[in-house]
């Protein structure tokens, strides 16, 4: 930590890496919930024009794709992987790519992904081949 930067009283935003350097936050697409035309594709772009600096350095990018009888939506946000999102743990938060995984939600089809590189939730990937065999 730079010596002139005060240590936080409320320490949750003074995040450092293993070498003691200040951890900078990443950039994520951040459009909250928007209607989407992404359907039956191996991958989709978010079509979100808003890129934000995540509020906290530990946050990662998240995308949530939902389809019900009426519409399809895509949600893009930053979120702390230590906390559940839509009641699910972000298991893939360390991934550089946003690989969609289906979650069980009654009354809708629900996919979610998380990732930890700048704007990685702009390109959401549904293709099964990425889930198993693709190392990057």
């Amino acid at each position: 930590i730079p010596p002139h930067v005060q240590k936080s009283v409320n320490n949750d935003m003074m995040v450092t890496d293993n070498n003691g350097a200040v951890k900078f936050p990443q950039l994520c697409k951040f459009c909250d919930v928007r209607f989407s035309t992404c359907d039956n594709q191996k991958s989709c772009l978010s079509n979100c024009s808003i890129t934000s600096i995540c509020e906290k350095p530990q946050e990662v990018c998240v995308a949530v794709w939902r389809k019900n009888d009426e519409n399809i939506t895509l949600e893009t946000v930053c979120h702390d992987p230590k906390l559940p999102y839509h009641d699910f743990i972000l298991e893939d938060a360390a991934s550089p790519k946003c690989i969609m995984k289906e979650k069980k939600k009654p009354g809708e089809t629900f996919f979610m992904c998380s990732c930890s590189s700048d704007e990685c939730n702009d390109n959401i990937i549904f293709s099964e081949e990425y889930n198993t065999s693709n190392p990057d």
Epitope: A21, V22, I53
Partner: nanobody, 122 residues
């Protein structure tokens, strides 16, 4: 030696404007990520804005979007933060920081200025 020196802070009324400057020396300006980061009294760091080079793409925290504008003048080796519609919650020490890639490891070397105090109060 890399040096970053902020200026332009001061006391301003709510709704007012300020422009912060960060004079850089000791490196080729305009080649790295530059940030404005602030720290309110007794709080942690808040990462306000980033400008990339090349290309000059700019990014903002949601809390300042539409009110703050980051820019750089490579000929003057200076980074700026134009702050409009200031609020009491913008009161903080504002630091400029430079992030320089450390080889191909994906890691960075960071350099920080000493900070300039912005107080928004009536």
């Amino acid at each position: 030696e890399v040096q970053l020196l902020e200026s332009g802070g001061g006391l301003v009324q709510p709704g007012g404007s300020l422009r912060l400057s960060c004079a850089a020396s000791g490196f080729t300006f305009g080649t790295d990520q530059m940030w404005w980061v602030r720290q309110a009294p007794g709080k942690g760091l808040e990462f306000v804005s980033r400008i990339d080079s090349p290309g000059g793409r700019t990014y903002y925290a949601n809390s300042v979007k539409g009110r703050f504008t980051i820019s750089r003048d490579n000929s003057k080796n200076t980074l700026y933060l134009q702050m409009n519609s200031l609020r009491a919650e913008d009161t903080a020490v504002y630091y400029c920081a430079k992030r320089q890639p450390a080889g191909v490891s994906g890691k960075y070397v960071d350099y920080w200025g000493q900070g300039t105090l912005v107080t928004v109060s009536s």
